[in-house]
Interface confidence: low
C-alpha cells in the first residue's frame, strides 16, 4: 500500500480535521491565511480561522452536510475573499477573488511576498511576555504562528508547528525560573536563528519545485537522501523521494493540511521501515509526532556499506550503458545520482547534480556517435575539474575566514559582491554578504570530509535568498541570469562574476554617512550592520577603490563610532566629527 | 510501483543445492545491475553476489566462491542465485536487491541448510 494512497473522502476537511485533530487544524489554518493575507491584522485572522473550524466541526458530524465536499481550496480561497479590506490592502491582488480554482488559488500564490513591508519583531521585557503567555497561552502562541508565518510565506508549515512547541515549552520552564531571562533568552535567540535557517531552507526547496520543477526537487533528493541513507537500496530510496516531492509539493502550493498530514504518514513509514532504511533512525523514531519528523529531517548520514564495487562497472565499462540509458532515461540517471551520492557524503548536494548532468550530456552526446563506448570511456575524467573548484573555494575562503573572523570576513564578501552586483539594494547585499561570511562559524570548524556538504549547501540556500528578493525588484541582468540559468550552478555563476564594469558609480550623498548618538544604544549586531551599510554604500560610490582604502575609511568609522560614544555630548561629537570624517574619507577614495 | 519477489529457498540438507529466483517489477531491470543478500538469524545484512545489467560481470564474497553462481534473465526481469554445495553457515533468509545496496525492502526467501 502506498503511504499516500487513501479511500476517496467525501469531505476532505472533515477527512484533515480527523487527521490531524482540532489543534493542529487550527493551527496550521492560521498558518495558511497569514501566508496568504500577509497584512491582515491577527483578530482578523483568528476569526477566520475559527469560523473555518466551526465549519469543519459540522462536516465532521455530518460529511453530506452542505459544501462539506468543496475543495480545501474552494473553501479557504472563499473565505480569504470574505475580507472587506482586500482591494485597499492588497491591491490588485484582490483580482485573484474573481478567478476559479485552481487559477484562483496559483494567484495567491503569485502574491506571496518574501520580503513584505512588516515593522521588524521588537522582543518586549520578559516579564511582559511571560505575563501575557499566562494571561492567555492559546492567543500568545497563536500569535507567534501568525508573526512567523505572515513574514515568511513560505515556511515548512509542519515545521513551525514543531517550533511553537519549542517556544511553548521555553515559556512554561523560564517564567518560572529565578532569573526569567537568563533561561528565556538565549532560548529564543536559539528559536530565531534556527527559524530563519529553517525558512531559507524550504525556500530554496520551494524554489527548485516552482522555477526549476519536480525533476529537479526529485533529483536534489535523490543525492540528499542517498547520502544520508546509503544503506537503503535504490526501490526504497526512489520511494521516500517520490513521498518527500509529494509532501513538499503541497506545502510550496498553499496545501497545508495535506502537506502536515502526509508528513506524519511518511515519518510513520520511514519508522516502520527504519530496518530497511537507515541505523540512525531508532532515537528520531521513539520521539512524539513533531519531534519524530523533525528528527528524521535532520538526522546523520548512516554508515556507508563496506567495499562498494566501483561505479565504472555500470556506468562507464558495461557495454550496455546507451540501451540501458535509452530505455529508462531518468531512471538510469537515478541510479547513477543514488550510487554516486551514497559513496560520497563528503559532496555537496548540488556538486553531485552537477556531476549526474555531465554524465547525462554526455550519454546524450556519445550515444549517438558512431563508437558510442570510446566516446564516454573517459567521462569520469571530466568530473575532476568540477570536484576541485569547490574544494579550493572552500580551502580559499576557510583561510580567510580563519584569518579575519567573522566579522571581517563579512565585510570582505560585502565588497566583493557589492562589486560583481552593484545595482542590487543595500538591505540585500548586506542581508545576503552577512549570511554568506556565517559559511565560515558554520563550515570551516568541520574536517575536511564535512566542508563541502556543509558550505556549498549553505551558500545555495542564502544565494536563494538573493534571488527571491532580486525578483521581486529585478535591477541586475546579471543576478537574473546566474539566479534563472541553472540552479545547481548558482554558486559557480555568482563565483565567476568579476567587477562589473558597466555601472556608472552613485553620486556622493554626505546624508548616507551622517550618524547619530542613537548608534550608541544599539546592540553589537545592529551596530556592524550600521558599519556594513555604509562599507556597501562606500562601494557604491567608488567600486574602485581597493581594499588597503576601503580598511583605512572603515578604521577611521570604527574608531568616529567609539570616540563619540564615548564623548558627554555624543550628539555634537557625532556631528562635528563626522563631517571631518566625511571630507578625509572623500580624500582617501578620491571622491 | 517497485517489487522484488523472492522464490525457491527451503529446508536442504548439507551438500544439496537449491536456485533462487527474483522476480522483479515496476522499473526498468535490464537498466541495473542486481545483487543477492542475506541476514542470519541475529546478525545483520550481508552482501553475497552482484551482478551487471548486461550479466557479463559476477562478483561474490569469498566464502560463496565456487559454490554460487549468479545470473540473469533481462527477457523475464528475474534473477538467479544457483546454490551448490550448501552449508549450514549458509542459512539465512536471502534478499535480491537492485544494485549493490546490502539493505532491502523485500520480503526475501528462507533457506535453511541442516541434518
Known amino acids: 500500500r502506498g503511504v499516500f494512497r487513501r479511500d476517496a473522502h467525501k469531505s476532505e476537511v472533515a477527512h484533515r480535521f480527523k487527521d490531524l485533530g482540532e489543534e493542529n487544524f487550527k493551527a496550521l489554518v492560521l498558518i495558511a491565511f497569514a501566508q496568504y493575507l500577509q497584512q491582515c491584522p491577527f483578530e482578523d485572522h483568528v476569526k477566520l480561522v475559527n469560523e473555518v473550524t466551526e465549519f469543519a466541526k459540522t462536516c465532521v458530524a455530518d460529511e453530506s452536510a452542505e459544501n462539506c465536499d468543496k475543495s480545501l481550496h474552494t473553501l479557504f480561497g472563499d473565505k480569504l475573499c470574505t475580507v472587506a479590506t482586500l482591494r485597499e490592502t492588497y491591491g490588485e491582488m484582490a483580482d485573484c477573488c474573481a478567478k476559479q480554482e485552481p487559477e484562483r488559488n496559483e494567484c495567491f500564490l503569485q502574491h506571496k511576498d518574501d520580503n513584505p513591508n512588516l515593522p521588524r519583531l521588537v522582543r518586549p521585557e520578559v516579564d511582559v511576555m511571560c505575563t501575557a503567555f499566562h494571561d492567555n497561552e492559546e492567543t500568545f502562541l497563536k500569535k507567534y504562528l501568525y508573526e512567523i508565518a505572515r513574514r515568511h510565506p513560505y515556511f515548512y508549515a509542519p515545521e513551525l508547528l514543531f517550533f511553537a512547541k519549542r517556544y511553548k515549552a521555553a515559556f512554561t520552564e523560564c517564567c518560572q525560573a529565578a532569573d526569567k531571562a537568563a533561561c528565556l533568552l538565549p532560548k529564543l535567540d536559539e528559536l530565531r536563528d534556527e527559524g530563519k535557517a529553517s525558512s531559507a531552507k524550504q525556500r530554496l526547496k520551494c524554489a527548485s519545485l516552482q522555477k526549476f520543477g519536480e525533476r529537479a526537487f526529485k533529483a536534489w533528493a535523490v543525492a540528499r537522501l542517498s547520502q544520508r541513507f546509503p544503506k537503503a537500496e535504490f526501490a526504497e530510496v526512489s520511494k521516500l523521494v517520490t513521498d518527500l516531492t509529494k509532501v513538499h509539493t503541497e506545502c510550496c502550493h498553499g496545501d497545508l493540511l495535506e502537506c502536515a498530514d502526509d508528513r506524519a504518514d511518511l515519518a510513520k513509514y520511514i519508522c516502520e521501515n527504519q530496518d530497511s532504511i537507515s541505523s540512525k533512525l531508532k532515537e528520531c523514531c521513539e520521539k512524539p509526532l513533531l519531534e519524530k519528523s523533525h528528527c528524521i529531517a535532520e538526522v546523520e548520514n548512516d554508515e556507508m556499506p563496506a567495499d562498494l564495487p566501483s561505479l565504472a562497472a555500470d556506468f562507464v565499462e558495461s557495454k550496455d550503458v546507451c540501451k540501458n540509458y535509452a530505455e529508462a532515461k531518468d531512471v538510469f540517471l537515478g541510479m547513477f545520482l543514488y550510487e554516486y551520492a551514497r559513496r560520497h557524503p563528503d559532496y555537496s548536494v548540488v556538486l553531485l547534480l552537477r556531476l549526474a548532468k555531465t554524465y547525462e550530456t554526455t550519454l546524450e552526446k556519445c550515444c549517438a556517435a558512431a563508437d558510442p563506448h570510446e566516446c564516454y570511456a573517459k567521462v569520469f575524467d571530466e568530473f575532476k575539474p568540477l570536484v576541485e573548484e569547490p574544494q579550493n573555494l572552500i580551502k580559499q575562503n576557510c583561510e580567510l575566514f580563519e584569518q579575519l573572523g567573522e566579522y571581517k570576513f563579512q565585510n570582505a564578501l560585502l565588497v566583493r559582491y557589492t562589486k560583481k552586483v552593484p545595482q542590487v539594494s543595500t538591505p540585500t547585499l548586506v542581508e545576503v554578504s552577512r549570511n554568506l561570511g556565517k559559511v565560515g562559524s558554520k563550515c570551516c570548524k568541520h574536517p575536511e570530509a564535512k566542508r563541502m556538504p556543509c558550505a556549498e549547501d549553505y551558500l545555495s540556500v542564502v544565494l536563494n535568498q538573493l534571488c527571491v528578493l532580486h525578483e521581486k525588484t529585478p535591477v541586475s541582468d546579471r543576478v537574473t541570469k546566474c539566479c534563472t540559468e541553472s540552479l545547481v550552478n548558482r554558486r559557480p555563476c555568482f563565483s565567476a562574476l568579476e567587477v562589473d564594469e558597466t555601472y556608472v558609480p552613485k553620486e556622493f550623498n554626505a546624508e548616507t554617512f551622517t550618524f547619530h548618538a542613537d548608534i550608541c544604544t544599539l546592540s553589537e549586531k545592529e551596530r556592524q550592520i550600521k558599519k556594513q551599510t555604509a562599507l556597501v554604500e562606500l562601494v557604491k560610490h567608488k567600486p574602485k577603490a581597493t581594499k588597503e582604502q576601503l580598511k583605512a575609511v572603515m578604521d577611521d568609522f570604527a574608531a568616529f563610532v567609539e570616540k563619540c560614544c564615548k564623548a558627554d555630548d555624543k550628539e555634537t561629537c557625532f556631528a562635528e566629527e563626522g563631517k571631518k570624517l566625511v571630507a578625509a574619507s572623500q580624500a582617501a577614495l578620491g571622491l | 510501483q517497485v517489487q522484488l519477489q523472492e522464490s525457491g529457498g527451503g529446508l536442504v540438507q548439507p551438500g544439496n543445492s537449491l536456485r533462487l529466483s527474483c522476480a522483479a517489477s515496476?522499473?526498468?531491470?535490464?537498466?541495473?545491475?542486481m545483487s543477492w543478500v542475506r541476514q542470519a538469524p541475529g546478525k545483520g545484512p550481508e552482501w553475497v553476489s552482484s551482478?551487471?545489467?548486461?550479466?557479463?560481470?559476477?562478483r561474490y564474497t569469498d566464502s560463496v566462491k565456487g559454490r554460487f553462481t549468479i545470473s540473469r534473465d533481462n527477457a523475464k526481469s528475474t534473477l538467479y542465485l544457483q546454490m551448490n554445495s550448501l552449508k549450514p553457515e549458509d542459512t539465512a533468509v536471502y534478499y535480491c536487491?537492485?544494485?549493490?545496496?546490502?539493505?532491502?525492502s523485500s520480503q526475501g526467501t528462507q533457506v535453511t541448510v541442516s541434518s
Open positions: 515496476g522499473f526498468s531491470f535490464r537498466s541495473f545491475g
Open positions: 551482478i551487471n545489467s548486461s550479466g557479463d560481470d559476477t
Open positions: 536487491t537492485i544494485g549493490s545496496s546490502i539493505s532491502r
